[in-house]
């Protein structure tokens, strides 16, 4: 997928974390249960 940033950005977070994408990970999600 592609994201374009420019005149506006919804990436900013109100928390103390940075709004940039976190480092990539190969981790897969397991179903709960």
């Amino acid at each position: 997928s592609e994201t374009t940033t420019g005149t506006s950005s919804n990436s900013s977070q109100s928390t103390s974390n940075s709004g940039l994408a976190p480092n990539p990970t190969n981790a897969t999600t397991k179903a709960a249960g």
């Epitope: 977070q13 940075s18 709004g19 940039l20 990970t25």
Partner: antibody, heavy 118, light 107 residues
């Protein structure tokens, strides 16, 4: 040690395309986004965008969205940036830079000079 | 987009001097500001990230401080190898933006 080695200088005519490569070594290529930054002669730094090497997701600077293509080949730990419809004001040094979530652009390639001239 | 304004644009100083460069953001970027050093013909080098954290291998004479919209880079005692151009860069949100640079010259 982390190293990013870029392809050599290019001279292109207006309207042409250029493709710059960036070969990574010394770390897990898929563990960090790869960004691209350019610097026109005597000017400052301008972020063009970045690619996620695992998913190939990209985030672009609006200014370059219609002309830039970012790809990667994880089998050879190499990222590519192609800029099309070149103009004289695209003459610049183009850098790849690893982006770590915590530290930002922590390691940079040596730069590739692209000259656009008729 | 966020705008980053560095001041001064040019700075003349002598070896041993203490110098301070300021970077102001047009809106809060929390602590997420990085500083880079660039010498002519070379790639930028990361000095400081997250406002105040020294990158590995960077001498302790470099110090970053600030949060929100105002940040400073201080070099406590200038060495000959410190004369270069310095850029701030926000890493809080997209698009990633750099300041216009501060050229530090020998007086």
């Amino acid at each position: 040690q982390v190293q990013l080695v870029q392809s050599g200088a290019e001279v292109k005519k207006p309207g042409a395309s250029v493709k710059v490569s960036c070969k990574a070594s010394g770390y897990d290529f898929t563990g960090y986004h790869m960004g691209w930054v350019r610097q026109a002669p005597g000017q400052g730094l301008e972020w063009m965008g970045e690619i996620n090497p695992i998913t190939s997701d990209k985030t672009f600077n609006q200014k370059f969205k219609s002309r830039v293509t970012m790809t990667r080949d994880t089998s050879i730990s190499t990222a590519y940036m192609e800029l099309s419809r070149l103009r004289s004001d695209d003459t610049a040094v183009y850098y790849c830079a690893r982006r770590d979530y915590g530290t930002s652009l922590d390691y940079w390639g040596q730069g590739t000079t692209v000259t656009v001239s008729s | 987009d966020i705008q980053l304004t560095q001041s001064p644009s040019f700075l003349s100083a002598s070896v041993g001097d203490r110098v301070t460069i300021t970077c102001r953001a047009s809106k809060s970027i929390k602590k997420y500001l990085a500083w880079y050093q660039q010498k002519p013909g070379k790639a930028p080098k990361l000095l400081i990230y997250a406002g105040s954290t020294l990158h590995s291998g960077i001498p302790s004479r470099f110090r970053g401080s600030g949060s929100g919209t105002e940040f400073t880079l201080t070099i406590s005692s200038l060495q000959p190898e410190d004369f270069a151009t310095y850029y701030c860069q926000q890493h809080n949100e997209y698009p990633i933006i750099f300041g216009q640079g501060t050229k530090l010259e020998i007086k």
